[in-house]
């Protein structure tokens, strides 16, 4: 039945980029400017998306495909097909419902999006703080306090990184 119907329906022959024009005896007419049809057999063309304001054009609309938008600098995409633009914050900040806020003491964010995360607690791994944390950077953990006993060099390189769950040899 599906095959029969397609044989009888002249619109099924209209390719992408055209529409089946009922006003012109179901002739396949090209999509008007600023519209598209991405599949064959369509009776109307869809209006092209316009990337305005904070949205900028990533891909121009063609007769067979819609325009694609992304966000201008200072914003990043959210939602399917970049339906929304959310503002970036500076490093050392997080985006809240009321805008960008500085990271609280003891937390950091090294990116322009996302939330502030707590500094690493070096003592949990038996290490000491080598470099203090900031709003933009995590602390750097150094050797354990025992390794820094009098007479020991304070510039010894930290032990090689080991996988979690593995004990030192």
């Amino acid at each position: 039945f599906e095959r029969t119907r397609s044989l009888q329906d002249p619109c099924s022959n209209c390719p992408a980029g055209t529409f089946c024009d009922n006003n012109r005896n179901q002739i396949c007419s090209p999509c008007p400017p600023n519209s598209f049809s991405s599949a064959g057999g369509q009776r109307t063309c869809d209006i092209c998306r316009q990337c305005k304001g904070v949205f900028r054009t990533r891909k121009e609309c063609s007769s067979t495909s819609n325009a694609e938008c992304d966000c201008t600098p200072g914003f990043h995409c959210l939602g399917a097909g970049c339906s929304m633009c959310e503002q970036d914050c500076k490093q050392g900040q997080e985006l809240t419902k009321k805008g960008c806020k500085d990271c609280c003491f003891g937390t950091f964010n090294d990116q322009k999006r996302g939330i502030c995360r707590p500094w690493t607690n070096c003592s949990l791994d038996g290490k000491s703080v080598l470099v203090n944390g900031t709003k933009e950077r995590d602390v750097v953990c150094g050797p354990s306090p025992a390794d820094l006993s009098p007479g020991a060099s304070s510039v010894t390189p930290p032990a090689p990184a080991r996988e979690p769950g593995h004990s030192p040899q």
Epitope: L95, T96, K97, K98, I115
Partner: nanobody, 124 residues
């Protein structure tokens, strides 16, 4: 599949009112806080209001406080935004969003699902 479908947008004169609705499906609605955000033309997202899963706690952006009211009907799986005394600066696409937990605040977004949006135009 989790879905949020907004409705109720349109053209309204300054000083007028509109009521937006958001029909939710695909999850236990009463277990999650919900949020309205908006995107004015040419600008970024702006948080409008949030409500806890039970409806007992509500939060508003300063720009809409006293004019907008968020509410929910958990028996109908629907979120509402009553907008009164509308101003030209309220013109935007309004999005309904599901938060990741039942509680909410005026701080973190914590949004994991967005609707498609409904357009509100305030103009004389």
């Amino acid at each position: 599949e989790v879905q949020l479908l907004e409705s109720g947008g349109g053209l309204v004169q300054p000083g007028g009112s509109l009521r937006l609705s958001c029909a939710a499906s695909g999850f236990t609605f009463s277990n999650y806080a919900m949020t309205w955000v908006r995107q004015p033309p040419g600008k970024g997202l702006e948080w409008v209001s949030s409500i806890s899963g039970s409806g007992g706690s509500t939060y508003y952006a300063d720009s809409v406080k006293g004019r907008f009211t968020i509410s929910r009907d958990n028996s109908k799986n629907t979120l509402y935004l009553q907008m009164n005394s509308l101003r030209a600066e309220d013109t935007a696409v309004y999005y309904c969003a599901k938060e990741g937990t039942g509680t909410t605040s005026d701080y973190y977004y914590n949004v994991d699902v967005w609707g498609q949006g409904t357009t509100v135009t305030v103009s004389s």
